[in-house]
C-alpha cells in the first residue's frame, strides 16, 4: 500500500488552530512536475457534505512530502469530508477523513467501519441533542432510509446493512428531519472486495494474518498497519509518537499523537494513534489496552507490563507477544541504562530482581555516585520478581553520574550500573515579543532565549490586565508556534510572561520577566446610509447599505440593524457579524406593518453613528381562501376536487396548494401544488382504496393565503367504478398538467 497518512488535529475548542496534514513516506512524493510524478493534493470534498462558503482554506507545503490545510474560521468549516491524494501512476491513492461536529444532534459511535464483503454492517448514531422528529439516513448524499424517532434504541439510531458489497462503500449520514445537515452524524463505510482473510482477483489468496489491528488489502494482500506499527504483518511497534510504514514520521507538538486522528489508505480508514482513544483521541488507553483506538488487549504473563503504545513489555528472562516464552534469567531485571530527572525533584527509582532464594526488601540497595547507599522504602513482591522502590532525596547537580542497583542473597550478588542525568529547568532570559495587535487579540512570539536545559516541552504564556489582581490566565502553546491571545478587552494593557518546561516531573522553570502589551480598539466613525430595500415576501425584507469610501482598512467588526414597529412599540435587532457585508435578509417580520429602519457599524462593543432612518411598509399577508371546496370520489385511487376562486384578490394567483391527509391519521400531511391557477378542479391520484381523506387548499400570490374549509371524502372500494362521466374526469385530468 502507498505510505500516505492524513492527520487531523482535533483541538476543537478553537477552529482556527485546527489543521489537516497529509504526509507521504513515498520516495520523492509531492515534488510536482519533475520525474517523481504529481504532487500531494489535500482538499475539502464538497460533493456529498456541503457547508456554507467561507474564506478560502490555506494550503502550505512543507518540504516535498507534506502538505497542511489551515484557515478554518468557524466550527462549521470543519464538518465534512477531506481527502488527500498521493502516489504516482497506478499507485495513486486517496485517503479520506470524515469530520463530525462535536455539537451535532447525532454523533457516530464509530466513524469508520471497515467490513468484509457479505458481512452485516451496523452504523450507530448516538443522540446528543434530542429532537422528536424522524431520522433520515443517506448514502453518498442520496436518501437511503427513514427511522421514526421512537425507534431509537438506548439513545441510538441503528442502520443495519446486511450482506454488504463493495458498491455499498461511501459516506453515510444520519440527520433529524428538518435539522441542519451540519448536525448530522457522518460515517464512512469501507467494504473490502473479499470475504474475511482473503484477497486477490477471485478472492482466492489467503491474507498474511495482520497483527495489532492491521487490515489486509483486498487487491495486493499487504497489511495496512495502524499508526504506530510496522512490519509486513504489523508485528513491530514504533517508538511512542512515531508513525508511517517505517516509523519514519513523528507526531507534531508537545503531547505526541494526542488529539490527532490518523487516516490511512483503504481498507484501513481512520483511527486514533497508538495509545489513544475517544472521539477526539484525547483519552489514554485504559489499563490493559493498547494500540490504535486502544482496541487491543495485552494479557501479559510472567511480569510483563502493558505499554499502551506497544503492548507487553517483558521483564528480562521473558519474550513473546504475551511474555509467555522463557529466557535465561539474570538477577536484576528491566533496569534502564540511563535515567533523567529534573533538579530539586524527589523521584522514585525502581529496581526489580529475581533469583533463588527469592530477594526480599532489605536485599536490594541503591548506591549514589558519592557512595551514599539508599535502602528501599517499599517492596512489591510478586511470584516471579521483587521490585524495590527507592525514594531519592531532593536532587542536586552533583547527583549526576553513575548509580548502581545491587541485589545480594545467600545465592550470590548481581549489580547493574545506570547513568542519572540531573537537568536544570529552563528559565526565560527575555520577555515574549509582540508581533501584531488587534482590538481583542494579541499575537505573541513566546519562545525566547533561556538558561537551563532543553528540550522545551511546554511553553506557558501567563497574562492578565495590567495592574489587575485577578488570577493570571494561562495558555499552553506549541513551542514552535506563535500564539494568539484571544477574547481580550479592547484598549487594555496586558502584562505577559513566559514559563518554559522541559520533560519530566518538576520540569517547570521559573516565570520569565514581564512585558506590557496593549490591545487596540478605535471607535468606528463611519456613518452608513441605506441604499435601498425590497420586499421578498410578506414577512421578508432584503436591505442594502453603503459606507463612505475612506483610505486604509475598515475599522469595524460588523453591523447592527434595527427595525422599529411603531404600532406595536416593538424593536427588532439583527447583527451582521461581517464588516464586509452590505446586505442582509430580514425574515419573520409582520405583514402589513410600517417599520422604521436604521443601520450602525460596530467595533468591539463600540457603536458608530446610525444611518439616517428609512421607512418601510411591508405588504399585507396572502390572499383569501378559495371558496366552496368540494370532493368527489372517482375510483378506488382517485378523488376529484372542485372549488371557486377567492374573492377580492390583491393580485394574480401564482398557484394553489392542496393539503391531503388520511382522516384520523397521525402522519404528516402531503402538500401538492396546482401550478395552473386558472383551474378550478384537479384530480388527486395514487390514493388508497376504501380510505377516508381530508382535503383543504389555499392560494398563493406573494405569500401563502388562508386555508379553505376542510372537506372529507372516501375512495371507492377495490373493484368498484365511480359513477358519473368518466370521460369528463379524464378530460379534466389532461387539462390539469399535474
Amino acid at each position: 500500500a502507498v505510505d500516505l497518512t492524513l492527520l487531523a488535529n482535533l483541538r476543537l475548542t478553537d477552529p482556527q488552530r485546527f489543521f489537516l496534514t497529509c504526509v507521504s513516506g513515498e520516495a520523492g512524493a509531492g515534488r510536482g512536475s519533475d520525474a517523481w510524478g504529481p504532487p500531494l493534493l489535500l482538499e475539502k470534498d464538497d460533493r456529498i457534505v456541503r457547508t456554507p462558503p467561507g474564506p478560502p482554506l490555506r494550503l502550505a507545503r512543507n518540504g516535498s512530502h507534506q502538505v497542511t490545510l489551515r484557515g478554518f474560521s468557524k466550527p462549521s468549516d470543519l464538518v465534512g469530508v477531506f481527502s488527500c491524494v498521493g502516489g504516482a501512476g497506478a499507485r495513486r491513492t486517496r485517503v479520506i477523513y470524515v469530520h463530525n461536529s462535536p455539537g451535532a444532534h447525532l454523533l457516530p459511535d464509530k466513524v469508520t467501519h471497515t467490513v468484509n464483503k457479505g458481512d452485516t454492517a451496523v452504523l450507530s448514531a448516538r443522540v446528543h441533542k434530542e429532537k422528536q422528529t424522524d431520522v433520515i439516513w443517506k448514502s453518498n448524499g442520496s436518501y437511503f432510509y427513514t427511522l421514526d424517532w421512537h425507534e431509537a434504541q438506548d439513545g441510538r439510531f441503528l442502520l443495519q446493512l446486511p450482506n454488504v458489497q463493495p458498491p455499498s462503500s461511501g459516506i453515510y449520514s444520519a440527520t433529524y428531519l428538518e435539522a441542519s445537515p451540519l448536525g448530522s452524524a457522518f460515517f464512512r463505510l469501507i467494504v473490502r472486495g473479499c470475504g474475511a482473510g482473503r484477497w486477490g482477483p477471485g478472492c482466492t489468496k489467503e491474507c498474511p494474518g495482520c497483527l495489532h489491528g492491521g487490515v489486509c488489502h483486498d487487491h495486493d494482500g499487504e497489511c495496512v498497519c495502524p499508526p504506530g506499527f510496522t512490519g509486513t504483518r504489523c508485528e513491530q511497534a514504533c517508538r511512542e509518537g512515531r508513525f508511517g510504514q517505517s516509523c519514519q514520521e513523528q507526531c507534531p507538538g508537545i503531547s505526541g499523537c494526542r488529539g490527532l486522528t490518523f487516516c490511512l489508505p483503504d481498507p484501513y480508514g481512520c483511527s486514533c494513534g497508538s495509545g489513544w482513544r475517544g472521539s477526539q483521541c484525547q483519552e489514554a488507553c485504559a489499563p490493559g489496552h493498547f494500540g490504535a483506538d486502544c482496541r487491543l488487549q495485552c494479557q501479559c504473563q510472567n511480569g510483563g507490563t502493558c505499554d499502551r503504545f506497544s503492548g507487553c513489555v517483558c521483564p528480562s528472562g521473558w519474550h513473546g507477544v504475551h511474555c509467555e516464552k522463557s529466557d535465561r534469567i539474570p538477577q536484576i531485571l528491566n533496569m534502564a541504562s540511563e535515567l533523567e530527572f529534573n533538579l530539586e525533584t524527589m523521584p522514585r527509582i525502581n529496581c526489580a530482581a529475581a533469583g533463588n532464594p527469592f530477594p526480599v526488601r532489605g536485599s536490594i540497595e541503591l548506591r549514589k555516585p558519592d557512595g551514599t547507599v539508599l535502602l528501599s522504602t517499599k517492596a512489591i513482591v510478586e511470584p516471579e520478581k521483587t521490585t524495590a522502590e527507592f525514594e531519592v532525596p531532593r536532587l542536586v547537580l552533583a547527583d549526576s553520574g553513575f548509580w548502581e542497583c545491587r541485589v545480594s542473597t545467600s545465592g550470590g550478588q548481581d549489580s547493574r550500573r545506570f547513568k542519572v542525568n540531573v537537568k536544570v529547568p529552563p528559565v526565560p532570559l527575555a520577555a515574549p515579543r509582540l508581533l501584531t495587535k488587534q482590538s481583542r487579540q494579541l499575537v505573541v512570539s513566546p519562545l525566547v532565549s533561556f538558561s537551563g536545559d532543553g528540550p522545551i516541552s511546554t511553553v506557558r504564556l501567563h497574562y492578565r490586565p495590567q495592574d489587575s489582581t485577578m488570577d493570571w490566565s494561562t495558555i499552553v502553546v506549541d513551542p514552535s508556534e506563535n500564539v494568539t491571545l484571544m477574547n481580550l478587552r479592547p484598549k487594555t494593557g496586558y502584562s505577559v510572561r513566559v514559563q518554559l518546561s522541559r520533560p519530566g516531573e518538576g520540569g517547570e522553570g521559573a516565570w520569565g520577566p514581564p512585558t506590557l502589551m496593549t490591545t487596540d480598539c478605535p471607535e468606528p466613525l463611519l456613518q452608513p446610509w441605506l441604499e435601498g430595500w425590497h420586499v421578498e415576501g410578506t414577512d421578508r425584507l432584503r436591505v442594502s447599505w453603503s459606507l463612505p469610501l475612506v483610505p486604509g482598512p475598515l475599522v469595524g467588526d460588523g453591523f447592527l440593524l434595527r427595525l422599529w414597529d411603531g404600532t406595536r412599540g416593538q424593536e427588532r435587532r439583527e447583527n451582521v457579524s461581517s464588516p464586509q457585508a452590505r446586505t442582509a435578509l430580514l425574515t419573520g417580520l409582520t405583514p402589513g406593518t410600517h417599520y422604521q429602519l436604521d443601520v450602525q457599524l460596530y467595533h468591539c462593543t463600540l457603536l458608530g453613528p446610525a444611518s439616517p432612518p428609512a421607512h418601510v411598509l411591508l405588504p399585507p399577508s396572502g390572499p383569501p381562501a378559495p371558496r366552496h371546496l368540494h370532493a368527489q370520489a372517482l375510483s378506488d385511487s382517485e378523488i376529484q376536487l372542485t372549488w371557486k376562486h377567492p374573492e377580492a384578490l390583491p393580485g394574480p394567483i401564482s398557484k394553489y396548494v392542496v393539503e391531503v391527509q388520511v382522516a384520523g391519521g397521525a402522519g404528516d400531511p402531503l402538500w401538492i401544488d396546482v401550478d395552473r391557477p386558472e383551474e378550478t378542479s384537479t384530480i388527486i391520484r395514487g390514493l388508497n382504496a376504501s380510505t377516508r381523506y381530508l382535503f383543504r387548499m389555499r392560494a398563493s400570490i406573494q405569500g401563502l393565503g388562508d386555508w379553505s374549509n376542510t372537506v372529507e371524502e372516501s375512495t371507492l372500494g377495490n373493484g368498484l367504478q365511480a359513477e358519473g362521466p368518466v370521460q369528463e374526469s379524464r378530460a379534466a385530468e389532461e387539462g390539469l398538467d399535474q
Epitope: E523, R573, L606, L607, P613
Partner: antibody
Framework: EVQLLESGGGLVQPGGSLRLSCAAS????????MSWVRQAPGKGLEWVSY????????YYADSVKGRFTISRDNSKNTLYLQMNSLRAEDTAVYYC???????????WGQGTTVTVSS | DIQMTQSPLSLPVTPGEPASISCRSS???????????LDWYLQKPGQSPQLLIY???NRASGVPDRFSGSGSGTDFTLKISRVEAEDVGVYYC????????FGQGTKVEIK
Amino acid sequence: EVQLLESGGGLVQPGGSLRLSCAASGFTFSHYDMSWVRQAPGKGLEWVSYIYPSGGPTYYADSVKGRFTISRDNSKNTLYLQMNSLRAEDTAVYYCARGDWASRFATWGQGTTVTVSS
Amino acid sequence: DIQMTQSPLSLPVTPGEPASISCRSSQSLLHSNGYNYLDWYLQKPGQSPQLLIYLGSNRASGVPDRFSGSGSGTDFTLKISRVEAEDVGVYYCMQALQTPQFGQGTKVEIK
C-alpha cells in the same frame, strides 16, 4: 472609562411625579441605545423602558405604559425618565443601562432609589 | 411574551468546586442568523448587575474564563468551573429576542 451616574430618586407620595436623570461619560453617547431597568426591594430585575440612539423610537414595559416617558439629550449626554402617577409598586432601585451591538444592558449605572409611600 | 425559568433558585457552593445554573425559555431564542439571544448577568451583594455572557456563549470583556455559557434554542446553562468566594451573588438570565425578560434569579452563596 464608561460611566453612568443616575440621580433624581427620592420619596414621593402615590400619584406624584419624579424625574430621573442618567449622566453618561467615557463614550459617544449619541451612538448607543439606552434603557432603564428597575429592581423592587428583595426582588429580581425588571426592564422598564428603552430609547433609540437618535431619541426616535421608544418603548415601555406594560406595567409603566402611559405613565412613564423616556427621553435623552444627546448634546448633554444625559438620559431621562419622567415618572407620573406613581404607585406603591413602582418603589425600586432604578438603573440606567447602555446597550451595545451584542447586548441590551452591557454597562450599568450604580442605581438611584425611588420610594412611593404615603 | 417569552417566559424565563431558572433553576435552582438557591445554590450553595464550595470554593474550588464547579457550579451550574440552568435557564429555560418558553420559546426558542435561536434566531435565523445563528445567534441565541440570551444574556447572563451577575449582581453581587450591594452592587449593580454586570454582564457576564452575551448571545448565549460569549464572555463579556473582563469576565474570568471560569465562567462559560452554553445551550441553544430553549435550554441554556451557565457553568463556573471552579467557584471563588467573589462569585457569590444573584445570577440572572435574560432573553433579548423580544421585549427583554429576566429569569427569577439564582442566589449563589458559600456553604
